[in-house]
Amino acid sequence: ESLGWDIAELQLNHTGPQQDPRLYWQGGPALGRSFLRGPELDKGQLRIRRDGIYMVHIQVTLAICSSTSTSRHHHPTTLAVGICSPASRSISLLRLSFHQGCTIASQRLTPLARGDTLCTNLTGTLLPSRNTDETFFGVQWVRP
Amino acid sequence: ESLGWDIAELQLNHTGPQQDPRLYWQGGPALGRSFLRGPELDKGQLRIRRDGIYMVHIQVTLAICSSTSTSRHHHPTTLAVGICSPASRSISLLRLSFHQGCTIASQRLTPLARGDTLCTNLTGTLLPSRNTDETFFGVQWVRP
Amino acid sequence: ESLGWDIAELQLNHTGPQQDPRLYWQGGPALGRSFLRGPELDKGQLRIRRDGIYMVHIQVTLAICSSTSTSRHHHPTTLAVGICSPASRSISLLRLSFHQGCTIASQRLTPLARGDTLCTNLTGTLLPSRNTDETFFGVQWVRP
């Protein structure tokens, strides 16, 4: 572990209450193929424990969705991954809208610091699928 | 190689016969920019030779496709990546539907074990593009 | 650095003049969360400085876009990432069309050599967003 190979792959636990757009994640072998090796979960949000450049990736699929589900809303359903605490480092890292699709998937390299908590905000009125092969979120430390 | 840097990037060889939804892959420098360094191919399916956590990624583009091609079906064309053998470890790792799009692309971290064979199942009646910059599938060992 | 951990994450600087489909990139901590550690920029294009297999990833979001923006064109807006110089190694590595979506995101493993310059060509009449969480391009050296 001293090599700094911090890594996590999470599955969706639940969505937040109505005014809370955050997705709440869970991880661990007992749950399936999710795991946390270094990073930790704090009330369903992912907290980084080692400084470095990370590859952050996410896939979110909307539940019981068709093209018409996503196209018939004024404001497209949007997913944003960002640092939500500490407040001084708050920033959006990755943002995608569903438009006429039902799945978004992306990845990016970004510097993260020990103590950064990542939030994944899903805005809109459609629910994310909890199927573990459709919705997942992970980080991988790649270099100091 | 003893570091465990197993890695592969494959290009589409062909689709299966009508009742076989699997995509058949090929790799090697003679074919272009595809390669296998550690993992191996078994009848067009990717077999893992080293235990560890892998980053699995895929992009599939449908051939001569427009939004109407994908939207006019009851059942959206779907791509699933999973462990198909050994049967005791069979599971879907990653699943995406095309809906009104013509390309899906995603990636995820997942634990894989020596002997796991990964299958990529494309359900529907549209053909995947064989262009090497449009359809590809790869894995990268990232840690034990 | 001798470990060969070359890595870069870039943000969009600007598009080219009308007959130039290339996107021009920029990177550096002063600009936000982008950085270059090994690779370098040559007139906005990313140049590789170390041989190896790289994970190349990109996300491009179209500015002020809705599904109708992308669907009402004869020729779908397309993004291609390729080696554009040296000419002897010119090849398209990754290609995606927007169809009825407003964002494309993908990644792939590919061998790159010192001196390879990567170009990202956006064809069509829609502009890419310059928001750093919507449009970004990066490479990560993963093994020799």
Epitope: - | A63, I64, S69, S71, R72, H74, T125, L127, N131 | -
Partner: antibody, heavy 120, light 111 residues
Framework: EVQLQQSGPELVKPGASLKMSCKAS????????IHWVKQKPGQGLEWIGY????????KYNEKFKGKATLTSDKSSSTAYMELNSLTSEDSAVYYC?????????????WGQGTLVTVSA | DIVLTQSPASLAVSLGQRATISCKAS??????????MHWYQQKPGQAPKLLIY???NLESGVPARFSGSGSGTDFTLNIHPVEEEDAATYYC?????????FGGGTKLEIK
């Protein structure tokens, strides 16, 4: 076994309209596009257009826009083509055809054809 | 529209010999790693019958004496050895884009 049964021959007067049918059996009607093809006596084949019965998505050859209208009735698994303002140029055998397994425009199953004769 | 030109317009081949029919497209019908060219057989008073799809794939139930080849703009249908029942008109057809178009046909007579 897949079958496409077309309606019988038609003798019509110039300026009239007619609607021919193509009844599908042996498969799920709404799963497959139905194409229509024209063949003038002793001549080659011309694609008119297609209809997808699932959502009534249609595409026409520019040459036949305004001449042909494609519709379907899911309840009876029947596709229809209506031809209007008929002239002697419309005298031909008209075939309905079903695509093959893959959803692209090549034609694995054909109806027997409907002969249309336009004559005063 | 893509124009398909077949040659010859007609040919006569002896029983057991090889029949070769050519189809030339006005632009490439290759895309996405496939060749979108197909061949049909039509006998008098009958509907066309699919023989070959995607340039070289034999349709189920079609005898192996039929074969297709070619890519880009130049295509060939071969029948070998020719049998009596192969007397018919043969058409090429592309599906590279809409509208799909057909060649003018080649009439095969068995000597």
């Amino acid at each position: 076994e897949v079958q496409l049964q077309q309606s019988g021959p038609e003798l019509v007067k110039p300026g009239a309209s007619l609607k021919m049918s193509c009844k599908a059996s042996g498969y799920t009607f709404t799963d497959y596009v139905i194409h229509w093809v024209k063949q003038k006596p002793g001549q080659g084949l011309e694609w008119i257009g297609y209809l997808h019965p699932y959502n009534d998505d249609t595409k026409y050859n520019e040459k036949f826009k305004g001449k042909a209208t494609l519709t379907s009735d899911k309840s009876s698994s029947t596709a229809y083509m209506e031809l209007n303002s008929l002239t002697s140029e419309d005298s031909a055998v008209y075939y309905c055809a079903r695509r093959g397994y893959y959803d692209y425009a090549w034609f694995a199953d054909w109806g027997q054809g409907t002969l249309v004769t336009v004559s005063a | 529209d893509i124009v398909l030109t077949q040659s010859p317009a007609s040919l006569a081949v002896s029983l057991g010999q090889r029949a070769t029919i050519s189809c030339k497209a006005s632009k490439s019908v290759s895309a996405s790693g496939y060749t979108w060219m197909h061949w049909y057989q039509q006998k008098p008073g009958q509907a066309p019958k699919l023989l070959i799809y995607l340039a070289s794939n034999l349709e189920s139930g079609v005898p192996a004496r039929f074969s297709g080849s070619g890519s880009g703009t130049d295509f060939t249908l071969n029948i070998h050895p020719v049998e009596e029942e192969d007397a018919a008109t043969y058409y090429c057809q592309h599906s590279r884009e809409l509208p799909p178009t057909f060649g003018g046909g080649t009439k095969l007579e068995i000597k």
